[in-house]
Interface confidence: medium
């Protein structure tokens, strides 16, 4: 058993049929010595008396809010949550496996630049009685500070018969050094509580590996005289790190016909303009990637040829 | 050229060669993103390779103030990686494919380090400890980790030279 926060405790249980469970001793936080009784949740049934209560925690029915009273007055509470371990593996029932970039990916994180700011998100099908708490650091043995906000519900989607809820959190490294080469990964830890079930999820990454620039901005076409060619121009996204002479991007320009089956023409360039042939009903798209480190490409920015 | 006296390197040449190094480092190990840090075993290897740190003066402001600190740091790292790529970790079994970019990568590391410090100029003696003998079963993982670290190192070096070529060239 360990303390998650004040008056909230997590009991770690090996979860199998007829498991013996865990013996827990609760102590009433009071100077009083006699006349103390204990109840669980809203029930008025007295579970025991005395300053301490010893219980055997085996299942969710044994978890919940234990309250000690004296003469109708509440003295203190202890909320017991369960963390299940099945076949030596902690349960992951609350969050959905996003399976990208690999199986058992529950948390996904992205950064728009090298400022030390990043966003993580996760999915669940649970709609109520759900709380999240997020902590992060750079390195684990001698951790350096990363400050995370509160996790918020950022999207709801319908998937077949189910509703899916996306939660996200923004974090910022306290003393970020955008130009340095990271040697210690960022660690992100999410505590998830659904009713009386506790689970924790972790992710470890370098900012450089989760970089995904915003799409190029101000995408414009300029037809070239007496030619089917156009000059496409764009700018670095506002959110990208500066100066651009140091934090450089490379770009992919694509000409795509109306039909998905039509051949795509692609040009790669380090410049912020390119000359391409504009076919009728086609569209021109541009995306960006860090020039020197192959992290994710941005989403496409697009304009129609006409 | 970056020499102890503090003259400038051939920024544009360094830019071109460092960008080539980035391309080679990724073609030598393109699938880097798909391996989980926590599945890689010993973290010591990552700590054993050079890193360009915050105080090394490789940020735009530090380069403007005095690029020598950063260039020396990059030079040290290039020599270090060049030695690693020439060690039995890469030359021993299992053999690399004949067309592996590791050979080109090794030569380019040497080329860029020489551009930074031509013959006859010395920042300091390059000191590198004895490498642990590695076995075939350890080498694949070591190659992966070294190449992945090298990708990060040369990305910073390439940014430095690109910025230098754009803003510090005479």
């Amino acid at each position: 058993i360990w303390e998650l926060k004040k008056d909230v405790y997590v009991v770690e249980l090996d979860w199998y049929p007829d498991a013996p469970g865990e013996m827990v001793v609760l102590t009433c936080d009071t100077p009083e010595e006699d006349g103390i009784t204990w109840t669980l949740d809203q029930s008025s049934e007295v579970l025991g008396s005395g300053k301490t209560l010893t219980i055997q925690v085996k299942e969710f029915g044994d978890a919940g809010q234990y309250t000690c009273h004296k003469g109708g007055e509440v003295l203190s509470h202890s909320l017991l949550l369960l963390h299940k371990k099945e076949d030596g593996i902690w349960s992951t029932d609350i969050l959905k496996d996003q399976k990208e970039p690999k199986n058992k990916t529950f948390l996904r994180c992205e950064a728009k630049n090298y400022s030390g700011r990043f966003t993580c998100w996760w999915l669940t099908t649970i709609s109520t009685d759900l709380t999240f708490s997020v902590k992060s650091s750079r390195g684990s043995s001698d951790p350096q500070g990363v400050t995370c906000g509160a996790a918020t519900l950022s999207a709801e989607r319908v998937r077949g018969d189910n509703k899916e809820y996306e939660y996200s959190v923004e974090c910022q490294e306290d003393s970020a050094c955008p130009a340095a080469e990271e040697s210690l990964p960022i660690e992100v830890m999410v505590d998830a509580v659904h009713k009386l079930k506790y689970e924790n999820y972790t992710s470890s990454f370098f900012i450089r590996d989760i970089i995904k620039p915003d799409p190029p901005k101000n995408l414009q076409l300029k037809p070239l005289k007496n030619s089917r060619q156009v000059e496409v121009s764009w700018e670095y996204p506002d959110t990208w790190s500066t100066p651009h002479s140091y934090f450089s991007l490379t770009f992919c320009v694509q000409v795509q016909g109306k039909s998905k089956r039509e051949k795509k023409d692609r040009v790669f360039t380090d410049k912020t303009s390119a000359t391409v042939i504009c076919r009728k009903n086609a569209s021109i798209s541009v995306r960006a990637q860090d020039r020197y480190y192959s992290s994710s490409w941005s989403e496409w920015a697009s304009v129609p040829c006409s | 050229r970056a020499v102890p006296g503090g003259s400038s390197p051939a920024w544009t040449q360094c830019q071109q060669l460092s960008q080539k190094l980035c391309t080679l480092a990724w073609s030598a190990h393109p699938l880097v993103g798909h391996m989980d840090l926590r599945e890689e075993g010993d973290e010591e290897t990552t700590n054993d390779v050079p890193h360009i740190q915050c105080g090394d003066g490789c940020d735009p402001q530090g380069l403007r103030d005095n690029s020598q600190f950063c260039l020396q740091r990059i030079h040290q790292g290039l020599i270090f990686y060049e030695k690693l790529l020439g060690s039995d970790i890469f030359t021993g079994e299992p053999s690399l494919l004949p067309d592996s970019p590791v050979g080109q990568l090794h030569a380019s590391l040497l080329g860029l380090s020489q551009l930074l410090q031509p013959e006859g100029h010395h920042w300091e003696t390059q000191q590198i400890p004895s490498l642990s003998p590695s076995q075939p079963w350890q080498r694949l993982l070591l190659r992966f980790k070294i190449l992945r670290s090298l990708q990060a190192f040369v990305a910073v070096a390439a940014r430095v030279f690109a910025h230098g070529a754009a803003t510090l060239s005479p």
Partner: antibody
Framework: QVQLQESGPGLVKPSETLSLTCTVS????????VHWIRQPPGKGLEWIGV???????DYNPSLKSRVTISRDTSKNQFSLKLSSVTAADTAVYYC??????????????WGQGTLVTVSS | DIVMTQSPDSLAVSLGERATINCKPS????????????LAWYQQKPGQPPKLLIY???TRQSGVPDRFSGSGSGTDFTLTISSLQAEDVAVYYC?????????FGQGTKLEIK
């Protein structure tokens, strides 16, 4: 928790071969480099040699002609043999491990040591 | 071989006072690439094996009290005990693992004054 324990005869005659065993528990020996170090009574520490994770060895040049270090992975055991001993080889013999890295490490776990006296 | 010279050979310090031991290798132990110094400090009490205190010149081994600290780089290293405790009476050794053969300093005997 990694544990190392040296064992072997406490007395060896001059010109004979000293043989010691180091048994490792609490981890697979394949991920350790195991070193032998000795300490003559009342004196300092001297590195004898190492057997690397892959089974290759390196020895102190001052002892190289007389030392053999080997291992038996099935028994999680390492052995030290020092031939043609003299009274100068009387010492406490330790085995110690370092964790495999790109470069050889420091010794983080040591055995308790075994005293070997060379005397007729 | 790299020769490790420790000073002083013996040292008597009052309880609660600072103790300082030096170690000078005959060549630099600083790896210019990764900026690590391949030097460790050990404490040995009578009848016991050496115990690792500090590695990479300045990193304290887990479980070692924070009164022990290591500093220095290249060819000059120091082990400092900020406030001597009775249980710190021992012989202290430095070790280089930059090149083999690994070599130890000759040891410094620390006693209470």
């Amino acid at each position: 928790q990694v544990q190392l324990q040296e064992s072997g005869p406490g007395l060896v005659k001059p010109s004979e071969t000293l043989s010691l065993t180091c048994t490792v528990s609490g981890g697979s020996i394949i991920s350790y480099n195991v070193h032998w170090i000795r300490q003559p009574p009342g004196k300092g520490l001297e590195w004898i040699g190492v057997i690397w994770t892959g089974g290759s060895t390196d020895y102190n040049p001052s002892l190289k002609s007389r030392v053999t270090i080997s291992r038996d992975t099935s028994k999680n055991q390492f052995s030290l043999k020092l031939s043609s001993v003299t009274a100068a080889d009387t010492a406490v013999y330790y085995c110690a491990r370092d964790k495999y890295g790109l470069f050889p490490g420091y010794f983080d776990y040591w055995g308790q040591g075994t005293l070997v006296t060379v005397s007729s | 071989d790299i020769v490790m010279t420790q000073s002083p050979d013996s040292l008597a310090v009052s309880l609660g006072e600072r103790a300082t031991i030096n170690c000078k290798p005959s060549q630099s132990l600083l790896s210019s690439g990764n900026r690590k110094n391949y030097l460790a400090w050990y404490q040995q009490k009578p009848g016991q094996p050496p115990k690792l205190l500090i590695y990479y010149a300045s990193t304290r081994q887990s479980g070692v009290p924070d009164r022990f600290s290591g500093s220095g780089s290249g060819t000059d290293f120091t082990l400092t005990i900020s406030s001597l405790q009775a249980e710190d009476v021992a012989v202290y050794y430095c070790l280089q693992h930059f090149n083999y053969p690994w070599t130890f300093g000759q040891g410094t005997k620390l006693e209470i004054k």
